[in-house]
């Protein structure tokens, strides 16, 4: 469930802090409820970038697990189509700390509406 997703995000945050990765990532910091699935997709795609750049097994496995969890939770809600949402590349670029904080925020949005 989404609580597991948040714990994975916390784990990724801890792992990244010890690695000093200074990438900037497309970050949706003001998610409109009607675009939350699209925003989630952008967060997950950017997480893959972190995983790729880190070359770290723990980060890789945690990111993969997070994607598997999110996939299963969202698939159980049926196919959700959203329109008029920003493309990932249109989002503001932020540092990893801000990116992860925004990610936790969107997950909490899913928790509150489930």
């Amino acid at each position: 469930n989404w609580v597991n997703v948040i714990s994975d995000l916390k784990k990724i945050e801890d792992l990244i802090q010890s690695m000093h990765i200074d990438a900037t990532l497309y970050t949706e910091s003001d998610v409109h409820p009607s675009c939350k699935v699209t925003a989630m997709k952008c967060f997950l795609l950017e997480l893959q970038v972190i995983s790729h750049e880190s070359g770290d097994t723990d980060i890789h496995d945690t990111v993969e697990n997070l994607i598997i969890l999110a996939n299963n939770i969202l698939s159980s809600n049926g196919n959700i189509t959203e329109s008029g949402c920003k493309e990932c590349e249109e989002l503001e670029e932020k540092n990893i700390k801000e990116f992860l904080q925004s990610f936790v925020h969107i997950v909490q949005m899913f928790i509150n509406t489930s």
């Epitope: 997709k41 790729h52 890789h60 496995d61 996939n71």
Partner: antibody
Framework: EVRLMASGGGLVQPGGSLRLSCAAS????????MSWVRQAPGKGLEWVAT????????YYPDSVKGRFTISRDNSKNTLYLQMNSLRAEDTAVYYC???????????????WGQGTLVTVSS | DVVMTQSPLSLPVTLGQPASISCRSS???????????LEWFQQRPGQSPRLLIY???NRFSGVPDRFSGSGSGTDFTLKISRVEAEDVGVYYC?????????FGQGTKLEIK
């Protein structure tokens, strides 16, 4: 050439336990997630378990959850499947398979071992 | 759970002729990141399964180019442009977009 050798199969009574092993060679074992897939005699394929590269994350279908445990020892290049509370319907050839990472663009079971037969019968 | 349904279950083909196998999923298997994790496996008699196609249409290394995959959403197809004797066996589609990962029932290809 990637090599996967499954072993440990045999005859076991219902309710019994068995541990399967899969020895990997000719590739960097710790860089790949791994899976077990089974095939009952004359039947189709059924996914049984998957484990992440480092071994922290495991995934199962409901049919084996709570009874089977997938694990790995990266220092020994070996994958395991601990099977408890075995039932007649667990009778099958068990294959181990290497899984390409989702993040590197694949997420497919690209190489398979030769399989080991598990028979559950009294 | 995602149910994968293959058709036909038996496929008699003349050597040199094309063959086509359909696989339909009970729901879309496009994942949250936009990927469709749909594979095709071949299992020759007495052998282990072998990966042919991954992510719908990508041919795995060493797989002859007479094999091709296509489809999207819930409908997928494996095509063999010209069947050869070594193609005899059972073909399975498989989705690993969503846990539990699931196989189709298999399609047995035989020579007429």
């Amino acid at each position: 050439e990637v090599r996967l050798m499954a072993s440990g199969g045999g005859l076991v009574q219902p309710g019994g336990s068995l541990r399967l092993s899969c020895a990997a060679s000719e590739f960097t074992f710790s860089n790949y997630a791994m899976s077990w897939v089974r095939q009952a005699p004359g039947k189709g394929l059924e996914w049984v378990a998957t484990i992440s590269r480092g071994g922290d994350y495991t995934y199962y279908p409901d049919s084996v959850k709570g009874r089977f445990t997938i694990s790995r020892d990266n220092s020994k290049n070996t994958l395991y499947l601990q099977m408890n509370s075995l039932r007649a319907e667990d009778t099958a050839v068990y294959y181990c398979a290497r899984r390409v990472s989702m993040i590197t663009g694949g997420w497919a079971m690209d190489y398979w071992g030769q399989g080991t037969l598990v028979t559950v019968s009294s | 759970d995602v149910v994968m349904t293959q058709s036909p279950l038996s496929l008699p083909v003349t050597l040199g002729q094309p063959a086509s196998i359909s696989c339909r999923s009970s729901q879309s298997i496009v994942d949250i990141t936009g990927n469709t994790y749909l594979e095709w496996f071949q299992q020759r008699p007495g052998q282990s399964p072998r990966l042919l196609i991954y992510k719908v249409f990508n041919r795995f290394s060493g797989v002859p180019d007479r094999f091709s995959g296509s489809g999207s959403g819930t409908d997928f197809t494996l095509k063999i442009s010209r069947v050869e004797a070594e193609d005899v066996g059972v073909y399975y589609c498989f989705q690993d977009s969503f846990v539990p990962y699931t196989f189709g029932q298999g399609t047995k290809l035989e020579i007429k």
